[in-house]
Interface confidence: medium
């Protein structure tokens, strides 16, 4: 296991590389803040199947971040 350094983050560990698009209810992006010094991408799954932390360095996460930023700015 690699060692993980943590601040006040919700996601522990690297997160998943990808989630099936059809399973995604919504995606939330937590930007670095006083709570956590790294970006976190949290996927809420459909049918109340919980949440997943998406690895922010993954291709899917980068696409989601880009999409959200385009929508917001």
């Amino acid at each position: 296991f690699p060692m993980f350094k943590r601040g006040r983050c919700l996601c522990i560990g690297p997160g998943v590389k990808a989630v099936k698009v059809a399973d995604i209810e919504k995606a939330s992006i937590m930007y670095p803040s006083n709570n956590c010094d790294k970006i976190e991408v949290i996927i809420t799954l459909k049918e109340n199947k919980g949440q997943r932390c998406l690895n922010p360095k993954s291709k899917q996460a980068r696409l989601i971040i880009k999409k959200v930023e385009r929508k917001n700015f």
Epitope: F1, M3, F4, K5, R6, R8, L10, C11, I12, G13, P14, G15, V16, N35, I42, G50, Q51, R52, C53
Partner: antibody, heavy 122, light 108 residues
Framework: QVQLVESGGGVVQPGRSLRLSCAAS????????MHWVRQAPGKGLEWVAL????????YYADSVKGRFTISRDNSKNTLYLQMNSLRAEDTAVYYC???????????????WGQGILVTVSS | EIVLTQSPATLSLSPGERATLSCRAS??????LAWYQQKPGQAPRLLIY???NRATGIPARFSGSGSGTDFTLTISSLEPEDFAVYYC??????????FGQGTKLEIK
């Protein structure tokens, strides 16, 4: 108020299995990283396992790796510890503890159960 | 694995006195250190998190200090209910989360 209640402990023979449960209430369980910590009779605290809020990654102490499995059911607000191939040295009081998410995060294990005794003996 | 060493193993003091408990880490844990109090037959209770922050409901007589490898828990004026075992714990580099071996604070 916040409550963590462990169950499933007892006396078990070496090599056998046991499953502990921890029922949570009074906080947002689905946002919280949860741990199992144990304490052998007359000894100090030993961290056993961690499961983040999403239940995807799981982390274990070397002493239990490959034998114990931590899991959670966020719909039931319940944490589990499946203990297989039990050994005499696993005899301890087992505590479940919360390490919060964004809500109420306190940078440590801020809520603990009362503990449940597991005795491994022939 | 980061090893936490607590000293002294036992501290004998009287109510009203000041208690100073030490925790030393084998490598830097930044400020990611917590302190817990445990009384016989009870679960541990979080006192201090992130080296110096008092947890909810903890009296002001408890304070924490330090960063890197050296940390101190101070109880400014001991109350009868403060006699217990105290543990430090790091959450900087893990797995595993590690605890110190404990300091027993007993009545002199």
């Amino acid at each position: 108020q916040v409550q963590l209640v462990e169950s499933g402990g007892g006396v078990v023979q070496p090599g056998r299995s046991l499953r502990l449960s921890c029922a949570a209430s009074g906080f947002t369980f689905s946002n919280s990283a949860m741990h199992w910590v144990r304490q052998a009779p007359g000894k100090g605290l030993e961290w056993v396992a961690l499961i983040p809020f999403d239940g995807y990654n799981k982390y274990y102490a070397d002493s239990v790796k490959g034998r114990f499995t931590i899991s959670r059911d966020n719909s039931k607000n319940t944490l589990y510890l499946q203990m297989n191939s039990l050994r005499a040295e696993d005899t301890a009081v087992y505590y479940c503890a919360r390490e919060g998410g964004y809500t109420g995060y306190d940078g440590g294990f801020d809520y603990w159960g009362q503990g449940i005794l597991v005795t491994v003996s022939s | 694995e980061i090893v936490l060493t607590q000293s002294p193993a036992t501290l004998s003091l009287s109510p009203g006195e000041r208690a100073t408990l030490s925790c030393r880490a084998s490598q830097s844990v930044s400020s990611y250190l917590a302190w817990y109090q445990q009384k016989p037959g009870q679960a541990p209770r979080l006192l201090i998190y992130d080296a110096s922050n008092r947890a909810t409901g903890i009296p002001a007589r408890f304070s924490g200090s330090g960063s890197g490898t050296d940390f101190t828990l101070t109880i400014s004026s001991l109350e009868p209910e403060d006699f217990a075992v105290y543990y430090c714990q790091q959450r900087s580099n893990w797995p595993p989360y590690t605890f110190g071996q404990g300091t027993k604070l007993e009545i002199k």
